[in-house]
Interface confidence: low
């Protein structure tokens, strides 16, 4: 299938559906959006790479999201701009299919990454004592890989091989669209899988997160708390260290485990705590018990000299629990926005009903270490967490809904939607990739500072920026 055109029909003036000034405007706007998307997502990726304080599990999810969004900024946005401005697809069917496959796979991977982040937050808030243990780098890597593989399986084979499945390519030269979209059932199916289902899941998760946060805030207000020496407003963390050989105390009675050396806490075998970096905002609000554990890792925190390392005695019985409790006040560096927090670490081994026992122990210690109610500022940090997630969810819905609504309308009435409206709807999906770095990264003080250092070329000590 070759192009057959009248004399000079290949010239932009003849083929473009837009006037010259419109073409200039479209190129400027689209080019700027592409540039902002590229810069924003490169900044996120480089920040995570160069700053060791940003190398946390939740930021690995952000890194994956930034990869997807960067590809959209580099390829998808610019090729779609070219297609829109010229008025036809000039690069042939092979490049067309490759572009479509890349576009849809990566856009869907971006959505899947948003889903992972939502699930991660949901489990952090609803299972603060058990989930952080499972939340390892390996598990994060598996979840990220699953997001990409699932997106690839959902879109790439159908886009690339549909013409061979049905035995004919119905996409004309000079055009570039997904051939199987002429099938209404497939259109509905993919729209549900790629947008409607993720939106429903993310909305349900957000509802649970906000409900958990609200109920915790209420509990915090009601619950009477025991007095404690005035250290500072404290955020209590409960972390259960699941059995693995590294977690077992080296000495027989386990009393020496997790002692403080030179005022510093030794690194745990546990991955960093379960809060998204972007919640570490520029304020010193305290939060309620195990609302969301601090995002700071042990190597980011200076331990107070007076930190106590205690242990619960344990029997030598094979089925019994071996449990060490460490209570310590973690004092963040002055430029950190995370409230000072008390750590309660429950280091366990094997045995039945282990989690329940450990949770009870942790809860008792939590009550012991809580501040008097009158000294505690209102727990607004949880509201910030919820607000961040709401912003992310709304950004996703606002940018993706128009296109996906049009897709469904189009199934019944193809000419109903003007081409300009269609193009804007398609572009809005891309704009989600521009917004994502702002939504996530800019809510995090460490990210902000690292961005600033990178943009101002201040590379000295950038790896330790907090």
């Amino acid at each position: 299938m070759n192009n057959s055109t009248n004399s000079s029909n290949n010239s932009l003036a003849l083929t473009s559906p837009y006037k010259t000034f419109e073409v200039v405007f479209i190129v400027l706007v689209a080019g700027s959006l592409s540039l902002v998307t590229i810069i924003g997502n490169i900044l996120v990726m480089v920040s995570i790479k160069v700053n060791r304080h940003l190398q946390t599990v939740n930021n690995y999810f952000l890194f994956s999201l930034a990869c997807a969004d960067l590809i959209i900024g580099v390829f998808s946005m610019n090729l779609y701009t070219l297609y829109t401005v010229i008025g036809y697809w000039p690069l042939g069917p092979v490049v067309c299919d490759l572009w479509l496959a890349l576009d849809y796979v990566v856009s869907n991977a971006s959505v899947m990454n948003l889903l992972i982040i939502s699930f991660d937050r949901y489990f952090c808030v609803t299972k603060p004592l058990t989930y952080p243990v499972k939340r390892t780098t390996k598990m994060a890597g598996m979840m990220i890989a699953a997001a990409w593989v699932l997106s690839f399986i959902l879109w790439a084979p159908a886009i690339l091989f549909w013409q061979f499945i049905v035995g004919v390519r119905t996409v004309e030269d000079g055009e570039c669209y997904i051939q199987f979209f002429s099938n209404a059932a497939v259109t509905f199916g993919t729209a549900i899988a790629a947008f409607y289902l993720p939106v429903i899941i993310m909305t349900v998760l957000y509802w649970h997160i906000s409900r958990a946060s609200k109920s915790r805030i209420k509990k915090d207000k009601k619950e009477p708390v025991a007095n404690q020496d005035p250290v500072s407003p404290s955020l209590v963390q409960g972390r259960i260290v699941k059995p693995n050989n590294n977690n077992m105390p080296s000495s027989d009675d386990g009393l020496e485990h997790n002692k403080i050396q030179n005022g510093k806490a030794p690194r745990d075998p546990v991955t960093e705590n379960c809060v998204q970096g972007e919640e570490k905002e520029s304020s010193n609000d305290s939060t309620s018990v195990s609302a969301v554990a601090s995002n700071m890792r042990d190597d980011e925190i200076t331990q107070d000299e007076n930190t106590v390392s205690t242990s619960l005695g344990h029997s030598k019985d094979e089925n019994s629990k071996q449990t060490c409790i460490r209570i310590g006040t973690k004092t963040p560096k002055s430029d950190s926005c995370t409230p000072t927090n008390t750590t309660v670490e429950v280091v366990g081994s094997s045995g039945q009903n282990g989690d329940e026992k450990q949770n009870i122990v942790a809860r008792k210690i939590v009550k012991m270490t809580k501040q008097p109610a009158k000294k505690k500022p209102p727990p607004s940090r949880e509201k910030k967490v919820t607000r961040t997630i709401l912003a992310i969810l709304l950004a996703f819905i606002i940018t993706w809904a128009p296109y996906n609504v049009m897709v469904l309308i189009n199934t019944f009435c193809a000419p109903c939607i003007p081409n300009t409206v269609w193009t804007i709807g398609y572009w809005l999906c891309y704009i989600n990739s521009t917004i994502n770095p702002a939504c996530y990264a800019l809510c995090n003080a460490t990210f902000k500072k690292t961005f600033k250092h990178l943009l101002m070329c201040h590379y000295k000590n950038i790896g330790a920026t907090r």
Epitope: N3, N9, Y88, P415
Partner: nanobody, 115 residues
């Protein structure tokens, strides 16, 4: 709501000509592309020709040099001029805006080439 309606089909002898029209109930200026498709009995629907907003015309190899597509935005109509018709051109011809997902299909117009 813009609806597309095909017309101009009929019975013609091999080597003969027909002109198909695709009339829109609203403006076609906003449609990036309008294409003609055909479906022969027992076969998959195949693309025949398309014309983009700026007048860029493109054709399937099987009809190149014999068919001509044009659009008249003032009349909101797209035409397919078919010359040197062959027996294998017998099919139901449809017009559509194929650059959108889930394009719905009209009734089409029957073209029969028979000696």
């Amino acid at each position: 709501q813009v609806q597309l309606q095909e017309s101009g089909g009929g019975l013609v002898q091999p080597g003969g000509s027909l002109r198909l029209s695709c009339a829109a109930s609203g403006s076609i200026a906003n449609l990036n592309s309008v294409g003609w498709y055909r479906q022969a009995p027992g076969k998959e629907r195949e693309w025949v020709a398309a014309i983009l907003a700026g007048g860029f015309a493109t054709y399937a190899d099987s009809v190149k040099g014999r068919f001509t597509i044009s659009r008249d935005n003032a009349k909101n109509t797209v035409y397919l001029q078919m010359n040197s018709l062959k027996l294998e051109d017998t099919a139901v011809y449809y017009c559509n805006t194929p650059d959108r997902p889930g394009a719905s299909w009209g009734q089409g117009t029957q073209v029969t080439v028979s000696s």
